[in-house]
């Protein structure tokens, strides 16, 4: 799973780098991008890099950054207001029931059947059955022939909230 | 290594006052918010107050406003509570605690407190 | 104010089995997709100690046995396999309101 930065990864100098406030928060909430402070008096902005709130709030902190692992890809840097948006590397894929890593995608369909959809970064190469036409999941078994598929051009990021 | 050393409990009669103290060593005290957890004899964890890294804003539970305060010198690396108009149901181990975004990822050994005439 | 109940108040468990506690809060800890709860063990004798926070992710150096999951109200906090240096109480917290409060506590026992 994509690590969350934690302070103790921030060079002290990060960690202390200066606050900036705003205004009195609004009905005891603070906007995107900033939190509130222990007393309720202040909105403290998030620290670009470091960490991000993305709607009003009232909590006394801004969310972690994700830090996309090894295997995967940064699509768009965290900002204030927004989390790092993370993507498996090319030939890889994410599946909604086991989020926490990227997988190898399957080099080829299994005999009897046809790629009927690529691998992309949040689905492995599609195979149905030449005859029926009925998908096929789960581990290819060793076979003689395999149809060769190309990985998948990235399309929609898959974002991994901290 | 983080260290948290609490120092200042003991045994007051209600309406007395007392001073804690916690000595931070091992990280950069004036970068992080710190809080006061309070267990009591039943074993459970109540927050009492919290202050952020350089001390200008803090938060007292409803338990204690008013009678509690949290303070830090962060030159001296060192968080204080000062209590007043102690009454029995203060009576607890206080724990200083540092506080890590959502978590409190270090706790010091804790300091008893018995407030009993 | 957010209440955390746990349960069970106490788990009698053999070593080398799986540990199940729960948490279940009075009202939602998510904020954007984040679940704001943090577990922590407390041995005899001994301060808190974290485990978990963010609901799953694992504390530095806390051991691979520990492993937290849920979203909404609901959360559990898991060990397997238990071992002997496990018998503590545990306690989960959240920090999505203030206060943040803390759950009454499991006791972790060894059948």
């Known amino acids: 799973e994509s690590a969350l930065i934690t302070q103790q990864d921030l060079a002290p100098q990060q960690r202390a780098a200066p606050q900036q406030k705003r205004s009195s928060p609004s009905e005891g909430l603070c906007p995107p991008g900033h939190h509130i402070s222990e007393d309720g008096r202040d909105c403290i902005s998030c620290k670009y890099g470091q960490d991000y709130s993305t709607h009003w709030n009232d909590l006394l902190f801004c969310l972690r950054c994700t830090r996309c692992d090894s295997g995967e890809v940064e699509l768009s840097p965290c900002t204030t207001t927004r989390n790092t948006v993370c993507q498996c590397e090319e030939g890889t894929f994410r599946e909604e029931d086991s989020p926490e890593m990227c997988r190898k995608c399957r080099t080829g369909c299994p005999r009897g059947m046809v790629k009927v959809g690529d691998c992309t970064p949040w689905s492995d190469i599609e195979c149905v059955h030449k005859e029926s036409g009925t998908k096929h999941s789960g581990e290819v078994p060793a076979v003689e022939e395999t149809v060769t598929s190309s990985p998948g051009t990235p399309a929609s990021p898959c974002s991994l909230s901290g | 290594e983080v260290q948290l050393v609490e120092s200042g409990g003991g045994l007051v009669q209600p309406g007395g006052s007392l001073k804690l103290s916690c000595a931070a060593s091992g990280f950069t005290f004036s970068t992080y918010g710190m809080s006061w957890v309070r267990q009591t004899p039943d074993k459970r964890l109540e927050l009492v107050a919290l202050?952020?890294?350089?001390?200008?804003?803090?938060y007292n539970s409803d338990s204690v406003k008013g009678r509690f305060t949290i303070s830090r010198d962060n030159a001296r690396n060192t968080l204080y509570l000062q209590m007043s108009s102690l009454k029995s149901e203060d009576t607890a181990m206080y724990y200083c605690?540092?506080?890590?975004?959502?978590?409190?990822?270090?706790w010091g050994q804790g300091t008893s407190v018995t407030v009993s005439s | 104010d957010i209440v955390l109940t746990q349960s069970p108040a106490s788990l009698p468990v053999s070593l080398g089995q799986r540990a199940t506690i729960s948490c279940r809060a009075s009202?939602?800890?998510?904020?954007?997709?984040?679940?704001?709860i943090q577990w922590y063990r407390q041995k005899p004798g001994q301060p808190p100690k974290l485990l978990i926070y963010?609901?799953?992710n694992v504390d530095s150096e806390v051991p691979a046995r520990f492993s937290g999951s849920g979203s909404g109200t609901d959360f559990s906090l898991y060990i397997h396999p238990v071992e002997e240096d496990d018998i503590a109480m545990y306690f989960c917290q959240q920090s999505r309101k203030v206060p943040w409060t803390f759950g009454g506590g499991t006791k972790l026992e060894i059948k």
């Open positions: 963010a609901a799953s």
């Open positions: 605690a540092r506080r890590d975004y959502e978590s409190l990822d270090s």
């Open positions: 202050i952020n890294s350089q001390g200008g804003s803090t």
């Open positions: 009202e939602s800890v998510e904020y954007s997709g984040t679940s704001l």
